[in-house]
């Protein structure tokens, strides 16, 4: 090999050992029979050398540094050449370094031809092995602007006072052009400006200077985003740290063309803006740090650019000003992660503050819009508390549990609407009366409606789930002893059409001791399946529930249990069931922990089924499923 560097070229070539490998045989640079491990060639020198091994690329690297002095004379602007040409260099991993020194008043701009650059974070590498490391200078201190790969959005980087650009090419890479040019600009009065150009939908992840170390104290760095006017951009902070500021705090400033409040200033912990149309600038301003404990400022953020959806120009008013103790959350449905680019799905408050989830609270009117390619990716969860604190005021008072129409009109599917119903302890109980009689969901007869009511205790220490109920059954009302939550859960988009079938009224009634009472009025046409609360987990210990089952005059009810024994084993107390005729008060009592369950029995009049649990041993729980079927009476027994 022969390397000849022209005089005054300000180029130095250094061939040195790379990262040591466990290769058995050493390799040397051979110059006129001398074996050396490092070779430095300066401007005006011409050196001929060979290597003592077959594959020097496994042992050596080559660095070609060109110093460009713009302090003492004119600057060589324009396209930067790879000198010496890669064809004249040995096939080693090579790094071309350009070190440009300039006055503080001079701005330097690196322009990258297509493909543009993509910034990578610590620990990441470029797929093709070609990396661009860019540094700037503040007085004598070197500041790392970042490390970049090809195929990104970064088109230009402006700096002042100097720039150091290192292009690393693996030995096998055929590239023979630098891919960038240098231009002079007026002073930029900041550390640097990075321009990022989006041609269409996509995302870019960018980092503050020196990331993941600290951003230089009291410095300013700007990113200019060029976005087609028909697209929308949203910013989200992936990772940040705040320094310990003396007085003025670090901040980000957005310059959004057309905004009436330019620049818009945000703290790093604020929700960052979204749904921005067209170009915008983002600047990071550091602060004067506390000398004793400065901390570090760093920021890694993502800009997501996507098509506005039809919904993004529509404003929806959610009027919760007359509601109390209610919160509505719009959030992403759980989905499997995809590896390919997925457009963001955001909900925006007042069109600008966009995030993947949003909670609206009662007492206000909210204006929201959506920036989302597919609104089925979102759903809504609502919580409302209805509480009674004064039993004298609440008794016999009724509330309608209905989803407000404002919520039904939103283009996002309702998942859950939960009412938390709170009563004064040992003073009042609750009764739920549906607009349409309810069916209890069981394996034998599942609900196939677009929504169900999930009824559960709302007492933190009590694990009691009464069950899931849907319209179209025989349960006329449900009475519960104390605080409960009633959740309307939807299962299909057709809920919008079936919304008229929802409707539940809750009333505060005098206190009673049983955990729950179900009033059942079976229809002649179908079999009613009923099961004890907390199915699969077992009725809680010492809990009592009842079913008040109506039998019309001309019918007979067949009560059937679906197993021979209850399976419960009591640790303390007894588990029993009472079946009582309401007219005669005649009752049968069954010990559930000892007796077999009754065979199918026929009831000509309304009757009660009461089940009371003991304290069972773990694993031996009380779960009962039974059915009631009406058939016409064949003989008049009255």
């Amino acid at each position: 090999f022969e390397i000849a560097l022209p005089r005054e070229s300000n180029i130095t070539v250094l061939i040195k050992l790379g990262t040591p490998t466990l290769l058995a045989k050493p390799c040397y640079i051979v110059i006129s029979k001398r074996h050396i491990t490092m070779l430095s060639i300066k401007s005006g020198e011409r050196i001929v050398f060979t290597f003592s091994c077959q594959s020097p690329e496994n042992h050596f690297v080559i660095e070609i540094q060109k110093n460009i002095d713009c302090m003492s004379g004119p600057c060589p602007f324009g396209e930067v050449q790879l000198q010496p040409s890669t064809s004249l260099l040995p096939t080693l991993n090579r790094t071309f370094i350009w070190d440009v020194k300039a006055h503080k008043s001079i701005g330097l701009e690196l322009q990258f031809s297509i493909p543009r650059l993509r910034q990578i974070g610590p620990g990441e590498s470029c797929p093709d092995g070609v990396t661009h490391s860019i540094s700037g200078r503040i007085d004598a201190t070197v500041v790392r602007i970042g490390t970049f790969c090809s195929n990104g959005t970064v088109s230009r980087i402006k700096m002042q006072e100097g720039v150091k650009m290192a292009l690393h090419l693996p030995w096998f890479h055929p590239r023979n052009v630098s891919g960038f040019s240098i231009a002079n600009r007026s002073s930029i009065k900041r550390l640097c400006i990075i321009e990022s150009v989006f041609e269409g939908e996509g995302s870019a992840t960018l980092m503050s200077a020196n990331y993941p170390e600290g951003f230089p104290e009291d410095e300013l760095m700007t990113w200019q985003f060029v976005v087609p006017a028909h697209l929308r951009a949203s910013v989200s902070f992936l990772n940040f740290n705040l320094s310990n500021c003396e007085r003025k705090e670090e901040r980000v400033e957005y310059y959004i063309p057309g905004s009436t409040t330019n620049p818009e200033v945000f703290k790093l912990e604020d929700k960052q803006p979204g749904n921005m149309a067209g170009n915008f600038n983002l600047s990071l301003q550091g602060c004067d740090q506390d000398a004793q404990s400065p901390g570090i400022l760093r920021l890694q953020f993502q800009v997501l650019v996507q098509h506005p959806q039809n919904e993004s120009n529509k404003i929806y008013v959610v009027d919760l000003s007359n509601e109390r103790a209610m919160s509505l959350t719009i959030e992403p449905r759980p989905v499997k992660q995809s590896r390919k680019f997925v457009p963001g799905c955001f909900v925006c408050l007042e069109s600008r503050t966009c995030s993947s989830n949003l909670t609206l609270t009662s007492g206000s009117k909210h204006k929201i819009s959506f920036l989302c390619d597919d609104l089925t990716r979102l759903w809504m969860n609502v919580e409302k508390t209805i509480s009674c604190t004064d039993h004298r005021y609440c008794q016999r008072k009724s509330y309608s549990l209905q989803v407000p129409s404002d919520i039904l009109h939103l283009p996002v599917e309702l998942h859950d609407f939960s009412w938390k119903l709170l009563v004064p302890k040992d003073r009042l109980s609750l009764v739920l009366v549906p607009a349409q009689k309810l069916q209890q969901h069981t394996h034998e007869k599942p609900c196939n409606t677009s929504f169900s009511y999930l009824v559960a205790s709302a007492i933190p220490s009590q694990d009691l789930y009464f069950g899931s109920f849907c319209p179209g059954g025989s349960i006329k009302q449900i009475q519960v002893k104390q605080n409960i939550s009633v959740t309307l859960r939807t299962f299909a988009p057709s809920f919008q059409q079936e919304a008229s079938r929802q409707g539940l009224t809750v009333s505060f009634i005098p206190y009673f001791k049983e955990e729950g009472v179900f009033t059942v009025t079976p229809d002649t046409k179908s079999k009613v399946y009923l099961r004890t609360p907390n199915w699969d987990r077992g009725l809680p210990s010492l809990t009592s529930v009842s079913w008040n089952i109506s039998v019309p005059r001309d019918q007979v009810a067949c009560l059937t249990f679906f197993k021979e024994r209850s399976g419960v084993v009591c640790q303390t107390g007894r588990a029993f069931m009472i079946i009582q005729e309401q007219r005669t008060r005649a009752e049968e009592i069954f010990s559930l922990d000892e007796d077999v369950l009754p065979k199918p029995s026929f009831h000509h009049h309304s009757f009660w089924v009461n089940i009371s649990n003991c304290s069972p041993t773990s694993g031996k729980q009380l779960d009962l499923l039974f059915s009631v079927t009406l058939t016409p009476r064949t003989v008049d027994l009255t």
Epitope: R251, K267, E269
Partner: antibody, heavy 121, light 107 residues
Framework: QVQLQQSGPDLVRPGESVKISCKGS????????IHWVRQSHAKSLEWIGV????????KYNQNFKGKATMTVDKSSNTAYMELARLTSEDSAIYYC??????????????WGQGTTLTVSS | DIRMTQSPSSMYASLGERVTITCKAS??????LSWFLQRPGKAPKTLIY???NLVEGVPSRFSGSGSGQDYSLIISNLEYEDMGIYYC?????????FGGGTKLEIK
């Protein structure tokens, strides 16, 4: 719900010290910084300082350096402020307030009920 | 330190009336301003943050506006429970500073 419960009123002599407490509940205590504010007839409301748990630092108003010391006991979800070398001018109501953020950069979203301090011989 | 000048220092207003309280900062505070109300003998309650954002649970009759150095709190339809002392707070830089307060009483 979020609550900041402060210690009760205190009567101390000039020259002594006092430690006021502020116990947070209803949220993850260390996720939010705690600010301290003084309300006196003479100077209305004054910001004393802030203690940030996520960044493990304290920041004081220059006027209260040497007068106030903010500490925290994370195990009991309690922030404390000790006031030293008390004079009658320190008689005031002292409030703790939660920062809406983990750092000390936000507005105060919840306030304690206040602790009345009387310095008198 | 940033000085916050609040006006008026006290005022009377009738129920149902529209009330405006203003706060002027000695420098641009970038809309990092909150308003809170202190009712007699009670802990302060924050109403507005970031100059114009309503804190959750605060009635929508309260609203905030302003930018740069000049900010306002508006109560559109005064109710009895709105009486008390209103303060503004800047959180743009350290030390945090407060307005002198506006005592609002019902006529």
């Amino acid at each position: 719900q979020v609550q900041l419960q402060q210690s009760g009123p205190d009567l101390v002599r000039p020259g002594e010290s006092v430690k006021i407490s502020c116990k947070g509940s209803g949220y993850t205590f260390t996720d939010h910084a705690i600010h301290w504010v003084r309300q006196s007839h003479a100077k209305s409301l004054e910001w004393i300082g802030v203690i940030s748990f996520s960044y493990d630092n304290t920041k004081y108003n220059q006027n209260f350096k040497g007068k106030a010391t903010m500490t925290v006991d994370k195990s009991s979800n309690t922030a404390y402020m000790e006031l030293a070398r008390l004079t009658s001018e320190d008689s005031a109501i002292y409030y703790c307030a939660r920062d809406c953020y983990g750092s000390n950069r936000g507005y105060f979203d919840y306030w304690g009920q206040g602790t009345t301090l009387t310095v008198s011989s | 330190d940033i000085r916050m000048t609040q006006s008026p220092s006290s005022m009377y207003a009738s129920l149902g009336e529209r009330v405006t309280i203003t706060c002027k900062a000695s420098q641009d505070i970038n809309r990092f301003l909150s308003w809170f109300l202190q009712r007699p003998g009670k802990a302060p309650k924050t109403l507005i943050y970031r100059a114009n954002n309503l804190v959750e649970g605060v009635p929508s009759r309260f609203s905030g506006s302003g930018s740069g150095q000049d900010y306002s709190l508006i109560i559109s339809n005064l109710e009895y429970e709105d009486m008390g002392i209103y303060y503004c707070l800047q959180y743009d830089e350290f030390p945090r500073t407060f307005g002198g307060g506006t005592k609002l009483e019902i006529k």
